[in-house]
């Protein structure tokens, strides 16, 4: 007996052949003797199985001897053995029909888990196997789970049904909802003009939510909310922001906020959340600001950053083109008595520079002057 | 919804070979066929073969010593590739999808042969 | 090969007419016929199928009948959008043939 595998809601075509190249009597029957449809003459009839309006046949066929039975959006209940009967001899192909589901929507948050689950006819025992995007394989019977979805997770999913040493391919497009970056940091000098991006990694037609920035300060002994805002179709409109700082945001997605200045007090760690409409969770984004500031006090030239830096950043105060005066892994470098110049603080990780400010040390006799 | 999506080279010279191809979104790509069509107008609607997802191949005979179709079903891609043109087979060519009748089709393609 | 003939080549109507198209087909197809309609610069759309199935879609006030050789098609009560042109096909046997076209145009 021939074994065919179908998929929920597809078409699959049993095939039928005659010996003789030729259109002659058929009829096809499910196996409770029921008849699905035939031909009399060049005409197709259709007998009354639960099938009539989903079987059809193809007549440009029959003139080649091949007598198709071809079901459409089928149903897991299609499953059944069917049997062709042509020139006194009778076919029997046996059709089992699959479906695979995801347990809830295909747009999960980072983080959810993902459920697939096979719906299968009575008495089968299939195997299924799913590789994802990232190339990894799971396994499992009727139900097959993956905890903890990651950003890399979306995409097309694989998923192959084996029954009988045939196989089904499944495709099912999974989006993980996720910001593109879990964290960020900006560094930035003193007075100037901070920009915080949030960029999306997943697109969809309707973005409906609400939001809000949290910020921890690094001199502050508790976090503060700096911004709510909600979001309808794509368009940012804000609910509430503090007075100080004052930021604004953009009206128009990526979500995108600007402070006006960059200081000292505002160097911590902010986490923007943002609950999406008929969705359980939250997004998060960390994001963090590195503020530095060179100042020259009497006879002292120091350089100090405040916000969350790694203990591997070195802070150094070197006059330019010259070797560096002082290099330290700490927040607050200093010169005591520094030259006439201009002297360059540098925030750098492994000799690449984050964050550069320059002041300018005039003779002694005179004022320092900062560009 | 199926729908129907069509590439390829719109100019060619006399004696190149056309070559074609449509993607199916949508819709199940197994058990149907899945045909080209041209339609020039000294020639009306004239079809020029189909193919299955087995692979399965019917071809129109006025143009089989010159067509080939073929299947990239893990992509739901078939092609059309027809050699050594000449200004006769300057149409529009379609691809549809069929079991007897044409209920989907691309968006048409207008192909020129002039050297 | 299975030869389709329509007629008329062409038909003027007002809105609101009733108009019947005609498909002849060289050989008995039983009712393995269909009717498309096709707008300038489009490709043709499904109408009638087994020939006087309605697709699905498709306003009532298109119809078919017919088997054997002589078909028709008939739109009751013409509306602005129904000027177009109709093709009949036959899939009794390959090659698939289609026919010449009927064009309907505005009196």
């Known amino acids: 007996k021939k074994v065919v595998l179908g998929k929920k809601g597809d078409t699959v075509e049993l095939t039928c052949t005659a010996s003789q190249k030729k259109s002659i009597q058929f009829h096809w029957k499910n196996s409770n003797q029921i008849k699905i449809l035939g031909n009399q003459g060049s005409f197709l009839t259709k007998g009354p199985s639960k099938l009539n309006d989903r079987a059809d046949s193809r007549r440009s066929l029959w003139d080649q001897g091949n007598f198709p039975l071809i079901i459409k959006n089928l149903k897991i209940e299609d499953s059944d053995t069917y049997i062709c009967e042509v020139e006194d001899q009778k076919e029997e192909v046996q059709l089992l029909v699959f479906g695979l589901t995801a347990n809830s929507d295909t747009h999960l948050l980072q983080g959810q888990s993902l459920t697939l689950t096979l719906e299968s006819p009575p008495g089968s025992s299939p195997s299924v196997q799913c590789r994802s995007p990232r190339g990894k394989n799971i396994q499992g019977g009727k139900t097959l789970s993956v905890s903890q979805l990651e950003l890399q997770d979306s995409g097309t999913w694989t998923c192959t049904v084996l029954q009988n040493q045939k196989k089904v391919e499944f495709k099912i497009d999974i989006v993980v909802l996720a910001f593109q970056k879990a964290s960020s940091i900006v560094y930035k000098k003193e007075g100037e003009q901070v920009e915080f991006s949030f960029p999306l990694a997943f697109t969809v037609e309707k973005l409906t939510g609400s939001g809000e920035l949290w910020w921890q300060a690094e001199r502050a002994s508790s976090s503060k909310s700096w911004i709510t805002f909600d979001l309808k179709n794509k368009e940012v409109s804000v609910k509430r922001v503090t007075q100080d700082p004052k930021l604004q945001m953009g009206k128009k997605l990526p979500l995108h906020l600007t402070l006006p200045q960059a200081l000292p007090q505002y160097a911590g760690s902010g986490n923007l959340t943002l609950a999406l409409e008929a969705k359980t969770g939250k997004l998060h984004q960390e994001v963090n600001l590195v503020v530095m500031r060179a100042t020259q006090l009497q006879k002292n030239l120091t350089c100090e950053v405040w916000g969350p830096t790694s203990p591997k950043l070195m802070l150094s105060l070197k006059l330019e083109n010259k070797e560096a005066k002082v290099s330290k892994r700490e927040k607050a470098v200093w010169v005591l008595n520094p030259e006439a110049g201009m002297w360059q603080c540098l925030l750098s990780d492994s000799g690449q520079v984050l964050l550069e400010s320059n002041i300018k040390v005039l003779p002694t006799w005179s004022t320092p002057v900062q560009p | 919804q199926v729908q129907l999506q069509q590439w390829g080279a719109g100019l060619l010279k006399p004696s190149e070979t056309l070559s074609l191809t449509c993607a199916a979104y949508?819709?199940?790509?197994?058990?149907?066929?899945w045909s080209w069509i041209r339609q020039s107008p000294g020639k009306g609607l004239e079809w020029i073969g189909e193919?299955?997802?087995?692979?399965?191949?019917n071809y129109n005979p006025s143009l089989k010593s010159r067509v080939t179709i073929s299947a990239d079903t893990s992509k739901n891609q078939f092609s059309l590739k027809l050699s050594s043109v000449t200004a006769a087979d300057t149409a529009v060519y379609y691809c549809?999808?069929?079991?007897?009748?044409?209920?989907?089709w691309g968006q048409g393609i207008l192909v020129t042969v002039s050297s | 090969d299975i030869q389709m003939t329509q007629s008329p080549s062409s038909v003027s109507a007002s809105v609101g007419d009733r108009v019947t198209i005609t498909c002849r087909a060289s050989?008995?197809?039983?009712?393995?016929l269909a009717w498309y309609q096709q707008k300038s610069g489009k490709a043709p759309d499904l109408l009638i199928f087994?020939?006087?199935s309605l697709q699905s879609g498709v306003p009532s006030r298109f119809s078919g009948s017919g088997s054997g050789t002589d078909f028709t098609l008939t739109i009751s009560s013409l509306q602005p959008e129904d000027f177009a042109t109709y093709y009949c096909?036959?899939?009794?046997?390959?090659?698939?043939?289609f026919g010449q076209g009927t064009k309907l145009e505005i009196k």
């Open positions: 096909q036959q899939a009794n046997s390959f090659p698939y043939t």
């Open positions: 050989q008995g197809i039983s009712d393995w």
């Open positions: 949508g819709g199940s790509f197994s058990g149907y066929y």
């Open positions: 087994a020939a006087s």
């Open positions: 549809a999808r069929v079991l007897n009748w044409f209920d989907y």
């Open positions: 193919i299955n997802q087995s692979g399965n191949t």
